[in-house]
């Protein structure tokens, strides 16, 4: 698997997003778990509805929640007020058994708020080509621009 | 095992700008964090900023917004901080500290500093 | 800012006390806190993290309480080794900040 970057802002909510086959794992509850280590499994923080059919119920663990949009195939994670100790690596999940299969990696990264962040010289928001290595890049930044500011780069 | 060599002391003249270098060892470079914080004689310690090797993001205290700038050098495991416009305020010892794995819940291995003076 | 209020700013024990350093955020950094230990010629040693968490290779008689806004380290049964500066640090939000530190030194 790939990891997919998913950078936000301290303070504002994050949308994470992962697709799968909506036919191959029909009936499958899902989960959003965290890697803490390089060792160790993937600590569970939140998880579908119990029932699959409600997985469209938004369900939430402390500041973090989860809905499942199991005809379209999407699993969407929100993590909402992102502080610093958010970031890290994370997986969404397709859990049949005791067994669960891992949908998407995602490292969440979670920045200093860049309305105080006026230097050009920073790496902010480096561009994706030359500074990601089997990564794709999601910036679920919103806000408008300062005057002069130069927008995110886009992503693919 | 984990070690963090940092470059060594420098003597600059106000005005001046200054990079220093943070050569991690015993472990994965892009997997880790890597923070600075900023020592003045005597004083406590002052998170400067972070950032994270595998994308190269930052955050900066707003503090030494302008006045520091944290790069990564992936091919070479080098992280390295610039400080510029240097005065007397800025003499101090600069430590890089590796945060967790791709987060920062604890700062586990510190460098041996790197002590920089500022004088005429 | 979350401010980091640190007391005492300096303690005099003997080896074997017990001795308690405290630690008092600005506002709530839930368990958000990391405290190290600072020795001349050494480079700084993260102790606990997570308010209570005993990192790995650190000794029992370390340990770590509170969330919140009120933290404690307690060092028991002091070894001579134990007479350093400690620090308490909180990663709640940023600017990550510190405490004014606290010098243990033997009586």
């Known amino acids: 698997h790939n990891t997919t970057v998913f950078q936000g802002v301290a303070g504002q909510s994050l949308q994470v997003s992962c697709p799968y086959d909506s036919m191959k794992h029909w009936g499958r509850r899902k989960a959003w778990c965290r890697q803490l280590g390089e060792k160790g499994p993937c600590q569970r923080v939140v998880s579908t509805h119990n029932l699959w059919l409600l997985s469209f119920l938004r369900r939430w663990n402390g500041s973090t929640a989860i809905t499942d949009d199991t005809l379209g195939g999407t699993l969407t994670i929100t993590l909402r007020n992102l502080q610093p100790h958010d970031a890290g690596l994370y997986q969404c999940q397709s859990l049949h058994g005791s067994e669960a299969d891992t949908l998407r990696k995602v490292l969440v990264e979670v920045l200093a708020d860049p309305l105080d962040h006026r230097d050009a010289g920073d790496l902010w928001f480096p561009g994706e080509s030359e500074s990601f290595e089997d990564a794709h890049v999601e910036h679920s930044i919103s806000r408008s621009l300062l005057e002069g500011e130069i927008p995110f780069p886009p992503t693919s | 095992e984990v070690q963090l060599q940092q470059s060594g002391p420098v003597l600059v003249k106000p005005g001046a700008s200054v990079r220093m270098s943070c050569k991690p060892s015993?472990?994965?470079?892009?997997?880790?964090?890597m923070n600075w914080v900023k020592q003045s004689h005597g004083k406590s310690l002052e998170w400067i900023g972070s950032?994270?090797?595998?994308?190269?993001?930052?955050s900066y205290n707003q503090n030494f917004r302008g006045k520091a700038t944290l790069t990564v050098d992936k091919s070479s495991s080098t992280a390295y901080m610039e400080l510029n416009s240097l005065t007397s305020e800025d003499s101090a010892v600069y430590y890089c500290?590796?945060?967790?794995?791709?987060?920062?819940?604890?700062?586990?291995?510190w460098g041996q500093g790197t002590l920089v003076t500022v004088s005429a | 800012d979350v401010q980091l209020t640190q007391s005492p700013s300096f303690l005099t024990a003997s080896p074997g006390e017990t001795i308690t350093i405290n630690c008092r955020a600005s506002?709530?950094?839930?368990?958000?806190l990391a405290w190290y230990q600072e020795k001349p010629g050494k480079t700084n040693k993260l102790l606990i993290s997570?308010?209570?968490t005993l990192q790995s290779g650190i000794p029992s008689r370390f340990s770590g309480s509170g969330s919140g806004t009120d933290f404690t380290l307690t060092i028991s049964s002091l070894e001579p080794e134990d007479f350093a500066m400690y620090y308490c640090q909180q990663y709640s939000e940023y600017p990550f900040t510190f405490g004014s530190g606290t010098k243990l030194e033997i009586k």
């Open positions: 015993g472990y994965t470079f892009t997997d880790y964090y």
């Open positions: 950032i994270n090797p595998y994308t190269g993001g930052s």
């Open positions: 500290a590796r945060g967790s794995y791709y987060s920062n819940l604890g700062f586990a291995y």
């Open positions: 506002k709530s950094i839930s368990k958000y």
């Open positions: 997570s308010g209570s």
